[in-house]
């Protein structure tokens, strides 16, 4: 078997909302992945599990199941959304993200993703992690290639 390549492209969009009373930030972060099948046979993308960390704390998890089939020597671009919550011991971030005196409220998040693929009954896991800047002060769409959005998200418990 030849390799299956997973490339984390980046954040496609981040939609933010706040709960002022609870000093809580809700960020829905959509990420883009490229998955390349270098084999001469189709492979199944069984699931994608993702988590987002802020300051070494996991603030969101998501899982997509039964995603897609990638044909021989083909590539597919997949979007997945991770709902995140910044609250409790990190509620000081509410002050940062809602500060009126600054234009861009960039925070650094660690994006982690694991893709499980299957072919001929064999399963393979490929993981990626990357630090990304996300604006927690406004809804933002980032410049990435147009991609197919697979809205089959199941937030992990």
């Amino acid at each position: 078997p030849r390799s299956i390549e997973v490339k984390y492209i980046g954040v496609k969009s981040a939609y933010v909302s706040y709960d002022a009373e609870k000093r809580t930030i809700y960020l829905n972060i959509t990420n883009t992945l490229n998955i390349t099948n270098n084999n001469y046979y189709s492979v199944e993308v069984e699931n994608i599990t993702a988590q987002v960390q802020f300051s070494k704390t996991v603030i969101g998890k998501a899982r997509l199941n039964n995603i897609t089939n990638i044909g021989p020597l083909d590539m597919k671009q997949i979007d997945y959304t991770v709902p995140t919550v910044i609250a409790e011991e990190m509620s000081y971030m509410y002050d940062f993200c809602t500060l009126l005196s600054i234009k861009v409220h960039n925070i650094v998040l660690m994006m982690q993703v694991t893709v499980t693929t299957a072919y001929f009954g064999h399963s393979e896991q490929i993981s990626q992690e990357r630090y990304q800047y996300v604006d927690c002060g406004r809804n933002t769409t980032y410049q990435l290639a147009q991609s197919e959005y697979l809205n089959v998200l199941q937030p992990q418990q």
């Epitope: 000093r23 409790e88 011991e89 509620s91 000081y92 971030m93 002050d95 940062f96 960039n106 925070i107 650094v108 630090y131 800047y133």
Partner: antibody, heavy 117, light 107 residues
């Protein structure tokens, strides 16, 4: 307005301990971590450790483990720094400050500690 | 631990001049950097947080820039109250560490 009020100067003998305080006011005490720094006369700053009143989470610089202990009295919004087995190397000004994302936004006025026999 | 190398260590300048102080981190600190000003016998005061954002009440002649491992603080048209010592500090991973300081003196 946000204020961090530190206790007064201390003159202590070698081998003794000292406990200084940092009283926070003007904001919700449990929201922000409190940081502690050491500054030797005319020198740069060293981070000792921090204390988060939200969950009592305490982190120390390895260099100060066994030397510094951070505690809290939530009823008075006060964080304490205790230094043990004092030597002349511990003579310095100690600051508390409030943590903010990407910087420490409010600082106490400092507590001067002099270790001398 | 992440080391912060600040330069220059000292600077002799005249009122009205522009100065730039730089800070280099031993690894990527992802803009988690603060700049402080300290006058003799006083507490440090936050000037810039998260590398580029001016703290409340800080005059617009101050500006912070940089990313990755390289950061700088620029002061346009220096005023007499700007003299003192400047420190950078990373807040990426504990232990937070400070630069050695830049002493700004009047020429």
């Amino acid at each position: 307005q946000v204020q961090l009020q530190q206790s007064g100067a201390e003159l202590v003998k070698p081998g003794a301990s000292v406990k200084m305080s940092c009283k926070a006011s003007g904001y919700t005490f449990t929201t922000f971590p409190i940081e502690w720094m050491k500054q030797n006369h005319g020198k740069s700053l060293e981070w000792i450790g921090n204390f988060h009143p939200y969950n009592d989470d305490t982190k120390y610089n390895e260099k100060f483990k066994g030397k510094a202990t951070l505690t809290v009295e939530k009823s008075s919004s006060t964080v304490y720094l205790e230094l043990s087995r004092l030597t002349s190397d511990d003579s310095a000004v100690y600051y508390c400050a409030r943590y903010f994302y990407g910087g420490m936004d409010y600082w106490g006025q400092g507590t001067s500690v002099t270790v001398s026999s | 631990d992440i080391q912060m190398t600040q330069s220059p260590a000292s600077l002799s300048v005249s009122v009205g001049e522009t100065v730039t102080i730089t800070c280099r981190a031993s690894e990527n600190i992802y803009s988690s950097l603060g700049w402080y000003h300290q006058k003799q016998g006083k507490s440090p005061q936050l000037l810039v947080f998260a590398a580029t954002n001016l703290a409340d009440g800080v005059p617009s002649r101050f500006s912070g820039s940089g990313s990755g491992t390289q950061y700088s603080l620029k002061i346009n048209s220096l005023q007499s109250e700007d003299f003192g010592t400047y420190y950078c500090q990373h807040l990426w991973s504990v232990p937070w560490t400070f630069g050695g300081g830049t002493k700004l003196e009047i020429k």
